[in-house]
């Protein structure tokens, strides 16, 4: 009991827990289809235990496997919209450094508001994740309808 | 019935910053986005950028980016667009126009002309 | 961008001519695509939106069609009222981007 007292007081990133869990900022301007992510206690249920925001894009300091979540509602919308909409799309993907640039996920609208997807995959120390959303839609900004996270699995 | 009432003529100095009104009514206003396109004399029609009323948020034109803000005052059901560092290519025609959901812009507002003029 | 190319940029005709302007988009776009007619002084106005779908209290006379990158709208008898400047715009991706116009005028 006192060992688990004690690796409770361990901040999570000395356990190899890394874990963050992101809210959104904002959109890009034109020509820069990635959201911006906000993360800290002072904006409510959002952290950065490890990994940190690099000009609202995640960046990863511990190599390892994680699993990634990401949730994203399109504002103002209704299925008939969606359905207008199709070409709606969110990517998540490595996006820097570019000798590791790859696609981790791909979803599309199609015929709803919501789309949420997560998925186990390995990233190294220094990769950043980007989310690209494509279209002419916006994302809500409700932190229950729209959120971004990575948490470390194992090595 | 819906319509967006714009707010009258403005002649600004180069570099100075202009505020134009849009003030919806005969719908709900969070419900819709609201476009700004604006319309040089003689010219065609150029895409600024979309505004969510419901939240606040934005996406703008990149040749604007910087230089435009979208806001609005719920209360009136108001969308402000302020453009600044002024110069004489951006006299034009303002105009605001609501997305009926489809990227579709109906109605549209009267038009604001903004003259920039030293 | 998606460049939107509209054709001829400016049109005499009568009263009662068959009518045709074309609206090339530099990539596909599929079917997102609308028509505005502008009389001067005057805001723009919703004639076709989604290619091809006639908007509420628009006058039969006008049609659009075409998908992928090519577009025509179509005014099958000319009427006085008709006499304007129309404008295709591109609804698939931002930034949203506009023809150069298509001014139709009295012969």
């Known amino acids: 009991q006192r060992f688990a007292q004690a690796q409770q007081q361990l901040p999570l990133e000395s356990l190899g827990w890394d874990v963050a869990e992101l809210q959104l900022n904002h959109t890009g301007p034109q020509q820069d289809p990635r959201l911006y992510w906000q993360g800290g206690p002072a904006l409510g249920r959002s952290f950065l235990h490890g990994p940190e925001l690099d000009k609202g894009q995640l960046r990863i300091h511990r190599d390892g496997i994680y699993m990634v979540h990401i949730q994203v509602t399109l504002a103002i919308c209704s299925s008939t919209t969606a359905s207008r909409h199709h070409p709606t799309t969110l990517a998540v993907g490595i996006c820097s450094p570019a000798s590791r640039s790859i696609s981790l996920l791909r979803l599309s609208f199609h015929q709803g508001c919501t789309i949420a997807s997560q998925r186990l995959t390995p990233l190294a120390r220094g990769d950043t994740l980007c989310t690209n959303l494509t279209g002419t839609l916006l994302p809500s900004r409700n932190t229950d309808e729209t959120f971004f996270g990575v948490q470390w699995v194992r090595p | 019935q819906v319509q967006l009432v714009q707010s009258g003529a403005e002649v600004k100095k180069p570099g100075a910053s202009v505020k134009v009104s849009c003030k919806a009514s005969?719908?709900?206003?969070?419900?819709?986005?609201m476009h700004w396109v604006r319309q040089a004399p003689g010219q065609g029609l150029e895409w600024m950028g979309i505004?969510?009323?419901?939240?606040?948020?934005?996406s703008y034109a990149q040749k604007f980016q910087g230089r435009v803000t979208m806001t609005r005052d719920t209360s009136t059901s108001t969308v402000y667009m302020e453009l600044s560092s002024l110069r004489s290519e951006d006299t034009a025609v303002y105009y605001c126009?609501?997305?009926?959901?489809?990227?579709?812009?109906?109605?549209w507002g009267q038009g604001t002309l903004v003259t920039v003029s030293s | 961008d998606i460049q939107m190319t509209q054709s001829p940029s400016s049109l005499s005709a009568s009263v009662g001519d068959r009518v045709t302007i074309t609206c090339q988009a530099s990539q596909d776009i599929s079917n997102y695509l609308n028509w505005y007619q502008q009389k001067p002084g005057k805001a723009p106005k919703l004639l076709i939106y989604?290619?091809?779908s006639l908007e509420s209290g628009v006058p039969s006379r006008f049609s659009g069609s075409g998908s992928g990158t090519d577009f025509t709208l179509t005014i099958s008898s000319l009427q006085p009222e008709d006499f304007a400047t129309y404008y295709c715009q591109q609804t698939n991706s931002f930034p949203i981007t506009f023809g150069q116009g298509t001014r139709l005028e009295i012969k």
């Open positions: 989604d290619a091809s």
């Open positions: 005969g719908y709900t206003f969070t419900s819709y986005y």
């Open positions: 505004f969510n009323p419901s939240d606040g948020s934005t």
């Open positions: 126009a609501r997305d009926v959901g489809e990227t579709t812009f109906d109605p």
